[in-house]
């Protein structure tokens, strides 16, 4: 079954995926699709990097961390319901039939619709609902909390303080890392 | 004009060896996935290998792995299956075949590798 | 690895009839269900990827549809040119793998 994760109609959603380069510089093709992972690369490809770069991306998809140190987590722009469903992330170790594949289950919600909450720069308010598992199992779920009053260049910033925090860690700890060499 | 063209089939002993090329043109190579298929006389198609764009990743059916050899050489647009160790039952009719959209999109027109003594 | 039952093995039809051949698949496969028509001498062509997608070139009198593990080609009014093998292949899971194909003949 697929790991599930979630985020509200408007926000970015952030899918975790990394692996461990042998050698810093030494990428491994990555590509992310939209569907599960087929038999070979990806179906509905929305982004992928090959040795040196990102070679291919539509609108809204980006890799918001440093792919070249093997963080590949894709981060969907201003989602909509439209967005939901399970994404691909396959990473492509040269070999024989070496592919890693992890199937993402992305679940939009409507946005809810309440009073303007006084500013909050804490995590735990600003990410209400974010569940992570530590230590074993992967993370069930991630939720982002609604932010009506935090604009995407915030929620942009949060993410890349979450991503640089426990977060991160914890998501590595998922068994969506794998190392290369 | 999109096409690929297979060539390098013929008769061998078995225990020989063979390799067969796929000459592609009318699109970038290097961008795709490619795969060998094959169909014995009178039978269905059968998938033997692939390959990814850049050549670092490959693929083979248990029918023919540590016998087969899928590479490409994408400078000159060529994607190749080293044979060894031929059987009888290798006979067949082996096309090479672009994989895009989860799908083979592009055939070519097949050559024929036939083991018999 | 997953098993791609076609069904008939064959059939025969006449110009301006409408026919429907089946996969099944032995697990869910999503909609990773290719349709190739594959005439004596000739390699295959594509016909519909993804189940339901219908490939560049192809008419619009062939259709695919289903997901999970049951699909179905079908082509609306036969054309001369339709009598053929077709064959199904699932693109889901390592190895892909190809049913058994059917014979489309003209009765």
């Known amino acids: 079954s697929e790991v599930e994760y979630r985020a509200e109609v408007g926000q970015n959603a952030y899918l975790p995926c990394f692996y461990t380069p042998a050698a810093p510089g030494n990428l491994v093709p990555v590509c992310w699709g939209k569907g599960a992972c087929p038999v070979f690369e990806c179906g509905n490809v929305v982004l992928r990097t090959d040795e040196r770069d990102v070679n291919y991306w539509t609108s809204r998809y980006w890799l918001n961390g440093d792919f070249r140190k093997g963080d590949v987590s894709l981060t969907i722009e201003n989602v909509t319901l439209a967005d939901s469903g399970i994404y691909c992330c396959r990473i492509q170790i040269p070999g024989i039939m070496n592919d890693e594949k992890f199937n993402l289950k992305l679940v939009i919600k409507p946005a809810k619709v309440t009073p303007a909450p006084t500013r909050q720069r804490d995590f735990t308010a600003a990410f209400p609902r974010m569940l992570t598992t530590r230590g074993h199992g992967p993370a069930e779920t991630q939720t982002l909390g609604s932010l009506p009053d935090i604009n995407l260049t915030q929620i942009s910033t949060l993410a890349n303080e979450l991503r640089d925090s426990r977060l991160a860690n914890d998501l590595r700890d998922s068994g969506a890392t794998i190392r290369i060499g | 004009e999109v096409q690929l063209l297979e060539s390098g089939g013929g008769l061998v002993q078995p225990g020989g060896s063979l390799r067969l090329s796929c000459a592609a043109s009318?699109?970038?190579?290097?961008?795709?996935?490619m795969s060998w298929v094959r169909q014995a006389p009178g039978k269905g198609l059968e998938w033997v290998s692939a390959i990814s764009g850049s050549g670092g990743s490959t693929y083979y059916a248990d029918s023919v792995k540590g016998r087969f050899t899928i590479s490409r050489d994408n400078s000159k647009n060529t994607l190749y299956l080293q044979m060894n160790s031929l059987r009888a039952e290798d006979t067949a009719v082996y096309y090479c075949?672009?994989?895009?959209?989860?799908?083979?999109?592009?055939w070519g027109q097949g050559t024929l590798v036939t083991v018999s003594s | 690895d997953i098993v791609m039952t076609q069904s008939p093995s064959s059939l025969s039809a006449s110009v301006g009839d409408g026919v429907t051949i089946t996969c099944q698949a032995s697990q869910d496969i999503y909609n990773y269900l290719n349709w190739y028509q594959q005439k004596p001498g000739k390699a295959p062509k594509l016909l519909i990827y993804?189940?339901?997608s219908l490939q560049s070139g192809v008419p619009s009198r062939f259709s695919g549809s289903g997901s999970g593990t049951d699909f179905t080609l079908t082509i609306s009014s036969l054309q001369p040119e339709d009598f053929a093998t077709y064959y199904c292949q699932q693109a889901n899971s390592f190895p892909p793998t190809f049913g058994q194909g059917t014979k489309l003949e003209i009765k």
């Open positions: 993804a189940a339901s």
């Open positions: 075949a672009r994989y895009a959209r989860t799908a083979f999109d592009l």
């Open positions: 009318g699109f970038t190579f290097s961008s795709y996935y």
